[in-house]
């Protein structure tokens, strides 16, 4: 499947997941916490303040790094309290913290978490990079 199609499909699925999660968690626009979001890279479920959400590396990195193998499911939701519980040596996991001011940036940043060989392709198919 072409990368544009993958991302449009993932975005649509993400919005559906967020809607379902909002209903399950009783979230609405006035609820404290962080709304679910599609950050143009991957899907983040709604979260309460103080909660850490963990996700596995997104589909994009199967395009960037076709040789890497990642888990395809979102990491379990059992431990969201401790931002230091993530080990940078554990590749394939990205987190965001839900704070009173909203979502933190990804930790680690996607390249550090998911791996990226910047010398792997200098002249790759440009279609892969222009993802809407």
């Amino acid at each position: 499947m072409h990368s544009d199609c993958i991302f449009k499909k993932e975005q649509a699925m993400c919005l559906e997941k967020i809607q379902r999660a909002n209903e399950l968690m009783g979230f609405n626009d006035s609820s404290p916490g962080c709304p679910g979001m599609w950050d143009n890279i991957t899907c983040w479920k709604p979260a309460h303040v103080g909660e850490m959400v963990l996700v596995s590396c997104p589909e994009l990195f199967r395009i960037f790094n076709p040789d890497q193998v990642w888990e395809t499911e979102t990491i379990g939701e059992s431990d969201f309290g401790d931002s230091n519980s993530l080990d940078l040596s554990d590749m394939g996991v990205v987190s965001r913290n839900c704070t009173e001011d909203g979502w933190s940036e990804p930790f680690p940043h996607y390249f550090d978490a998911c791996g990226f060989d910047e010398y792997e392709s200098e002249t790759g198919d440009q279609d892969y990079y222009y993802l809407s």
């Epitope: 143009n40 940078l88 940036e105 940043h109 996607y110 390249f111």
Partner: antibody, heavy 120, light 107 residues
Amino acid sequence: QVQLVESGGGVVQPGRSLRLSCAASGFTFSRFAMHWVRQAPGKGLEWVAVISYDGNNKYYARSVKGRFTISRDNSKNTLYLQMNSLRAEDTALFYCARGYDILTGYPDYWGQGTLVTVSS
Amino acid sequence: EIVLTQSPATLSLSPGERATLSCRASQSVGRSLHWYQQKPGQAPRLLIKYASQSLSGIPARFSGSGSGTDFTLTISSLEPEDFAVYYCHQSSRLPFTFGPGTKVDIK
């Protein structure tokens, strides 16, 4: 090797506009986020803006939001900073830097900067 | 926005001495704190990422520690080329910010 070359700086009057460019080479530009960071003469570093690899995500410092626009042309391997309504306090050396990420990241390689002087 | 405070503003030491630089964040940044070195007339150079991760090409005498709000950059034994300004930078929350810098100069 990674190379970033800024251009477009100069002397401009308050209220006027200027567009900075940053030509990138030595890496796959279209896969990386890119930042602008500035440094007023004799002062510290101030983060200005970042743009994601595809241009869909853009974020700004409060001091420039609404006046500056970051953009990129991946077909030309070039990053831009459109600066409108310039003020004296915008006088600085403007660096472009590669973000080690697709979304934002931290600057890992920097250009040598282009000087913007806002003065009447 | 997250404010980063660096101390001391200036550190006067001799070559061979140990330098300890501090960076404090106004709220937790986890470990998304990075250190840069800048010499006069040059662009900044990334030294340490994620508070303590070393980078290839950076001498082993540079090390970092800390998490949350308190961070330290240590230069175990100062070389003449280490006299410069050091900045911390947080990429935990937008807008990103830099600290004001610590100048390490020769005593």
